[in-house]
Interface confidence: low
């Protein structure tokens, strides 16, 4: 047979037996001669070397490029291929002899003592136990031990060939600790030498790189890349790297097996691979592939090489972010660079410092925005190695739905007088401004609820057909003012008006403020009554501890049984089918509270007296009256406001002042407080008193010293004071230069 | 990723009631930061809008147009609607919806439109 | 109502080139309520910028808005092919009705 592609000049070594396989029988002679056309060289069994005694090759005596290959007695153990090949080529010819020895139908190894068989689990995967035959047509059956099972071949998946040997499934031996091949010649057995059953696993689990992504070095850094396998048990591993710069001088690899817990059912190997000093080369995917000769698995990871350490901001990075109060805002460092910078969040130029409200790491975290968080946030990117930093500002604004001042008043809102005008407002504080704020109205009649409409807390009109206001057919004729701008609380915000000229129909009023984030609405409950009518005695709000009176004064012809009633401070809910305005519809939120009754020629005065306001006395009290005729009940309702005791307080300093003889000197002071402070001036602890150039306005909180002498020189003290105590500031006044001297003198 | 379709009838009769409907998808026709409005073209000639709605329903009309438009919305089919009576030819056009980021703000979002013609 | 014009109704520029198109309005318009609009034929209008100079998601940094007042300006730094269009700039003033400009139409010269 011939092995290899021939040569365009060289033809193949020719032997002197032309036939592929040839039997003989033991103690016979072996010779076959080979002829070529270059130097030629002979293979044969158990000897790959070519030294062996018993065998001879001698150069033929009639030519050239001749061998001839003698083998004395030969034995069983010499059957096998020989094979004779030009020197330093592929091109050979190859004969196979059998050398029947019936006493030793196996060849024997060479080691003669046992062999080794390595085999895995898997169902998939036969092993080859190398009993070879030097009988091509030998009943052979394999025997595994202990406990001991014989498998015969099947003609399938069980099979021997004298040639190779015995092929089975290895999952078949994998619980036998050794195997030997038996062949039956005349009844009697021949045995193979033993060979040891070794269980290998191939299974890797999985291939990790570490470190796994975002490798970055510059010129001249240490490279460690480590390649862990984690295996079943019973495997070998064989890493293999590929990276780019393969000539690499300074690369060194490393590779050992990781000790794991005791009773653990895996194993771990690690190979690392180092660099010491990368250059732009070395930049690339590297990829390391561990192998246990059944499977393959590998992992990638990109290394990236930079010049030299650098940082800059990415394109994607903001210059204005827009949010919505109550929204969270993520404003991420966008960069490039190497290593990672330093990240420093400013806000207005003040370091930013974590807490429960903000995050400022790579990612600028603002849990629930709000107005005060507007401001222009510069991040400050250092390189940790080149110390070189980058600036970036971004401008966050922070945008505000309208908030309808006024819709924190919770309570309904007074009746009104019928014929008289009134002003409703709504006052729209927005984020930016809003685009408009619309009026709209509606009948209070037409708003009455539907049997099956339930009433929310929220949303207590259940109105659908609002109206227009300059669509005023059919109810109170209205002008809309144009918007106002008032700075009110530090705030600057939009105060819409809308002017009843004759409040002639109940009504409820809308107001509807909408800006680019959203919108915000109130509603506005304007009951008209031309019954009772309310009145305040003294006619201002009463601060807590004084008195007050709420008289109710109704026409005696039209109206009778006046009672005062107090609305609770949590209505009931309201019934469905039910009109939450006006109370008059709606008893059952009110309280019934004691009066005194007085009569003049015309009208009856119901009045009922608060001694010593509290501010749980707040609320809205209702008076209500029936009509004689037609008992109809008319109700009127008042919000009574109590202001709060406040001790005296006086904004802003006195300043110590200089001041040269003969100028004037004018200081304010204002003082808070409920009930409004008394303000007194002391001089040097003495009461100062008004005279020519002493003048004391608007209620002592101004004080002009006209013409100042030298006497005029002092520690100046304003002093607030009210029943709930006092409160002062001081300073002195120094007065320069001389005194002018006088005609008296 | 939101998107808009118009449908309707392609060809309306002079006098007739021209009737569009905008179905959303991707996207709640019920959010309270949204408002949706119908801008047409005539063919050859500029934008103009007609109006705008909330979810609630409340609409916002070109003064132009306000006698003969109603824009109405059904939360539940996520649409809205668009009638223009008395038509003329002059109301020929390619009718568009659009989502509005706010009332009165930039259309952000449209729908690809419909030709309305016209004509007896 | 607030009329929007634009000018001039037609730009002839060449790719790579520079594109300025106004818009003047008839009286003061808030900076934060005008957009500008790009329409090529047969599709809806796409949004380019809001409240003046605000580039909308998606558009490229060669387009740019500026202006205060009555006078805005939309500044294409380079053109490139797909640019040649229809441009409409659009207010969303406090009072209605919202309103747009008549357009530019910027062709390749």
């Known amino acids: 047979a011939s092995v290899g592609l021939p040569s365009v000049s060289l033809d193949l070594p020719r032997l002197s037996i032309q036939k592929d396989i040839l039997t003989i029988k033991a103690n016979t002679t072996l010779q076959i001669t080979c002829r070529g056309q270059r130097d030629l060289d002979w293979l044969w069994p158990n000897n790959q070397s070519g030294s062996e005694q018993r065998v001879e090759v001698t150069e033929c005596s009639d030519g050239l490029f001749c061998k001839t290959l003698t083998i004395p007695k030969v034995i069983g153990n010499d059957t096998g291929a020989y094979k004779c090949f030009y020197r330093e080529t592929d091109l050979a010819s190859v004969i196979y002899v059998y050398v029947q020895d019936y006493r030793s139908p196996f060849i024997a190894s060479v080691s003669d003592q046992h062999g080794v068989v390595y085999i895995t689990e898997n169902k998939n995967k036969t092993v080859v136990i190398p009993c070879l035959g030097s009988i091509s047509n030998l009943n052979v059956s394999l025997c595994a031990r202990y406990p001991e099972k014989r498998f015969v071949p099947d003609g399938n998946r069980i099979s021997w060939d004298s040639k190779k040997g015995f092929t089975i499934p290895s999952y078949m031996i994998s619980y036998a600790g050794m195997v030997f091949c038996e062949a039956k010649i005349n009844d009697e057995s021949y045995q193979s030498i033993m060979y040891i059953v070794v269980v290998v696993g191939y299974r890797i689990y999985d291939v990790v790189l570490s470190p796994s992504h975002g490798i970055e070095l510059s010129v001249g850094e240490k490279l460690v890349l480590n390649c862990t396998a984690r295996t079943e048990l019973n495997v070998g591993i064989d890493f293999n790297w590929e990276y780019p710069s393969s000539k690499h001088q300074h690369k060194k690899l490393v590779n050992r097996d990781l000790k794991t817990q005791s009773g653990s059912e895996m194993k771990k190997f690690l190979s690392t691979l180092t660099i010491d000093g990368v250059t732009r080369s070395d930049q690339g995917l590297y990829t390391c592939a561990a192998s246990s000769g059944l499977m393959t698995k590998k992992n990638s990871t990109f290394v990236r090489v930079h010049e030299k350490p650098f940082v800059a901001f990415g394109s994607g990075m903001e210059s204005l972010v827009e949010a919505t109060v109550g929204e969270r805002v993520r404003i991420p460092a966008k960069y490039l660079g190497y290593p990672p910078p330093e990240i420093k969040w400013y806000k207005n130029g003040i370091p930013l410092e974590s807490n429960h409200t903000i995050k400022a790491g790579h990612v600028l975290t603002i849990m629930e925005v709000s107005e005060r968080d507007t401001g222009n946030y510069t991040v400050i990117l250092t390189n940790p190695i080149s110390k070189e930093k980058q600036s970036h500002v971004v401008s966050l604004v922070v945008y505000v739905p309208p908030q309808i001042g006024e819709k924190s008043l919770i309570s309904p809102v007074d009746s009104y007088q019928y014929g008289t005008t009134q002003t409703l407002t709504c006052t729209v504080y927005a984020i930016p401004p809003p685009h408009h704020i619309h009026w709209y109205w509606q009948l209070e009649e037409e708003c009455a609820n539907e049997p099956s409409q339930a009433v929310s807390v929220t949303n207590p009109y259940p109105c659908e057909e609002w109206r227009s206001v300059e669509d005023f057919q059919g109810g109170n004729k209205i002008e809309v003012n144009k918007n106002q701008f008032a700075l009110i609380e530090g705030k600057n915000k939009t105060v819409s008006t809308l002017v009843i000229q004759a409040a002639n129909v109940s009504a409820l009023y809308k107001c509807e403020a909408v800006n680019k984030v959203g919108r915000g609405e109130r509603v506005i409950s304007f009951h008209v009554t031309r019954g009772p009518e309310i009145t305040l005695q003294p006619d201002m709000q009463p601060t807590e501890q004084e008195s007050v009176s709420l008289w109710c004064t109704a026409d005696r012809s039209t109206f009778e049984n006046l009672t005062w009633y107090k609305l609770g401070p949590q209505p009931l809910p309201i019934h469905v089918g039910e009109l939450p305005t006006p109370v008059c519809k709606n008893l059952d939120t009110l309280w019934k509270l004691n009066a005194t009754m007085f009569s003049n020629s015309t009208n009856d005065i119901l009045i009922m007296e608060l001694k010593n306001a509290s501010l749980q006395d707040q609320g809205d009290y209702v008076c209500l009256a029936q009509d004689r005729k037609t008992k109809k009940r008319h109700c009127v309702v008042r919000q009574l406001t109590v202001l709060e005791r406040v001790a005296p307080t006086i904004t802003g300093n006195l300043e110590n002042q200089t001041t040269s003889i003969g100028e004037s000197i004018e200081v304010s002071c204002t003082a808070s407080g409920n009930p409004p402070p008394q303000i007194m001036w002391f001089k040097d602890n003495e009461t100062l008193v008004e005279d020519s150039g002493i003048v004391l306005k608007d209620g002592n909180r101004n004080l002009t010293i006209r013409r100042v002498r030298k006497e005029d020189e002092g520690l100046y003290t304003c002093q607030a004071c009210s029943v709930l105590g006092c409160a002062k500031v001081e300073a002195f006044f120094i007065i320069e230069g001389a005194q002018e001297k006088t005609n008296l003198e | 990723q939101l998107q808009l379709q118009e449908s309707g009838p392609g060809l309306v009769k002079p006098s007739e009631t021209l009737s569009l409907t905008c179905t959303v998808s991707?996207?709640?026709?019920?959010?309270?930061?949204?408002?949706w409005g119908w801008i047409r073209q005539p063919p050859g000639k500029g934008l103009e809008w007609i109006g705008t709605?909330?979810?609630?329903?409340?609409?916002y009309y070109n003064p132009s147009l306000k006698s003969r438009v109603t824009i109405s919305v059904d939360t539940s089919k996520n649409q809205f609607s668009l009638k223009l009576s008395s038509v003329t030819a002059a109301d020929t056009a390619v009718y568009y919806c659009?989502?509005?980021?706010?009332?009165?703000?930039?259309?952000?979002?449209w729908g690809q439109g419909t030709l309305v013609t016209v004509s007896s | 109502e607030i009329v929007l014009t634009q000018s001039p109704g037609t730009l002839s520029l060449s790719p790579g080139e520079r594109a300025t198109l106004s818009c003047r309005a008839s009286?003061?318009?808030?900076?934060?309520?005008l957009a500008w609009y790009q329409q090529k034929p047969g599709q809806a209008p796409r949004l380019l910028i809001y409240?003046?100079?605000n580039r909308a998601t998606g558009i490229p940094d060669r387009f740019s808005g500026s202006g205060s007042g009555t006078d805005f300006t939309l500044t294409i730094s380079r053109l490139e092919p797909e640019d040649f269009a229809v441009y409409y700039c659009?207010?969303?003033?406090?009072?209605?009705?919202?309103?747009f400009g008549g357009g530019t139409k910027v062709e390749i010269k």
């Open positions: 659009q207010q969303h003033g406090s009072s209605p009705p919202l309103t």
């Open positions: 991707g996207g709640s026709i019920s959010s309270r930061s949204d408002y």
């Open positions: 659009a989502r509005q980021q706010l009332v009165l703000y930039y259309f952000d979002y």
């Open positions: 409240a003046t100079s």
């Open positions: 709605i909330y979810y609630s329903g409340d609409t």
């Open positions: 009286q003061s318009v808030s900076s934060s309520y």
